[in-house]
């Protein structure tokens, strides 16, 4: 399955929106920094399968969508930017859905996909528990925003690699 160029553009637009959503200085939140353990191994260019990567991307975007569409998130961010962010994520989900659907039924990759999906889910569980523990404070949201930006940047670079491999 070829991920369309629009998908990469959408990913970049989502990154720009995430950057614009920043309301407070990252430096004022240094005490709240946390290592969420982004599951880089899932996206490791040396050993990942294309289907595994696509499933993991989808899970990551779906979890990001869920994370930013809670009422706690709505209170933390500019509504206009948030709505634009939803639109970009929704478009990316549509692009990836078509790809995942094509990959469904390929038995030999199923086990690898299970672990990659679970690793992404656990990563977002850590983010969710962190936000709850910090009572959804502005600094906690800033730390999460920066973390999601990092993970999106990583996946954008990986998708370029995916297209080159094709």
């Amino acid at each position: 399955c070829d991920l369309p160029q629009t998908h990469s553009l959408g990913n970049r637009r989502a990154l720009i929106l995430l950057a614009q959503m920043g309301r407070i200085s990252h430096f004022s939140c240094l005490k709240d920094r946390y290592d969420f353990g982004f599951p880089q191994e899932v996206f490791d260019g040396n050993q990942f399968q294309k289907a595994q990567a696509i499933s993991a991307f989808h899970e990551m975007i779906q979890q990001t969508f869920n994370l930013f569409s809670t009422k706690d998130s709505s209170a933390a961010w500019d509504e206009t930017l948030l709505d634009k962010f939803y639109i970009e994520l929704f478009q990316q989900l549509n692009d990836l859905e078509a790809c995942v659907t094509q990959e469904v039924g390929v038995e030999e990759i199923a086990l690898m996909n299970e672990d990659s999906i679970l690793a992404v889910r656990k990563y977002f569980q850590r983010i969710t528990l962190y936000l709850m523990g910090k009572k959804y404070s502005p600094c906690a949201w800033e730390v999460v925003r920066a973390e999601i930006m990092r993970s999106f940047s990583f996946s954008t670079n990986l998708q370029k690699g995916l297209r080159r491999k094709d």
Epitope: Q62, F65, V100, V104, N113, L118, K122, Q125, L129, M132
Partner: antibody
């Protein structure tokens, strides 16, 4: 509010198949994985597998691999669980439960569907 | 597969008493992915505690959870009549997700 409504009780003969439905409402159906858990009479809970309603990808417990098929219909926000080659040990209440994160993991369950396998 | 073993199988206590239910995992479970559910006859399970020690919405403060690694505990500080039910621990740390066999809490 989130609601999961399952289809009614079924009685099946050994060797037959059963298809149980779970209709979701009160949230964006395609955003959350849906799981199936069963419970034999007087026994504990057993996870069978899950489906992502967005793209239809499934993950099944090894024990049910080859016998279970989970599908979805996004137009009606319904997921289905079909179990084939039924035997008496498959007599159980079958539940759908919505995934999520933190306090949302299995926070919402269907009312359960009793499947009786008897000759 | 991570096997969860709950003990005791049945616990007979009176209202007002303290209940301690154990869940032992066959291999280590990250505390973030260990949950507890309560089930009453004819009903679906109900989420009690998530991520080992966090109370789910609407659950009274008499319930608490603790533990790490392979040993986890659910405690009910002072039993109320509505607490008599079956309790299950559950892990989603690795596939396949598993439940303990349950502890039945009955009135003495």
């Amino acid at each position: 509010q989130v609601q999961l409504v399952q289809s009614g009780a079924e009685v099946k003969k050994p060797g037959a198949s059963v298809k149980v439905s779970c209709k979701a409402s009160g949230y964006t159906f395609t955003n959350y994985w849906m799981h199936w858990v069963r419970q034999a009479p007087g026994q504990g809970l057993e996870w069978m597998g899950e489906i992502n309603p967005s793209h239809g990808r499934t993950i099944y417990a090894q024990k049910f691999q080859g016998r279970v098929t989970m599908t979805r219909d996004t137009s009606t926000s319904t997921v289905y669980m079909e179990l084939s080659s039924l035997r008496s040990e498959d007599t159980a209440v079958y539940y759908c439960a919505r995934g999520g994160l933190g306090p949302a993991w299995f926070a919402y369950w269907g009312q359960g569907t009793l499947v009786t396998v008897s000759s | 597969e991570i096997v969860l073993t709950q003990s005791p199988a049945t616990l007979s206590l009176s209202p007002g008493e303290r209940a301690t239910l154990s869940c032992s995992a066959g291999s280590s479970v990250d505390s973030s992915y260990l949950y507890w559910y309560q089930q009453k006859p004819g009903q679906a399970p109900r989420l009690l505690i998530y991520s080992t020690s966090n109370l789910a919405s609407g659950i009274p403060a008499r319930f608490s959870g603790s533990g790490s690694g392979t040993d986890f505990t659910l405690t009910i500080s002072s039993l109320e009549p509505e607490d008599f039910a079956v309790y299950y621990c559950h892990q989603w740390s690795s596939y396949p997700f598993t439940f303990g066999q349950g502890t039945k809490l009955e009135i003495k």
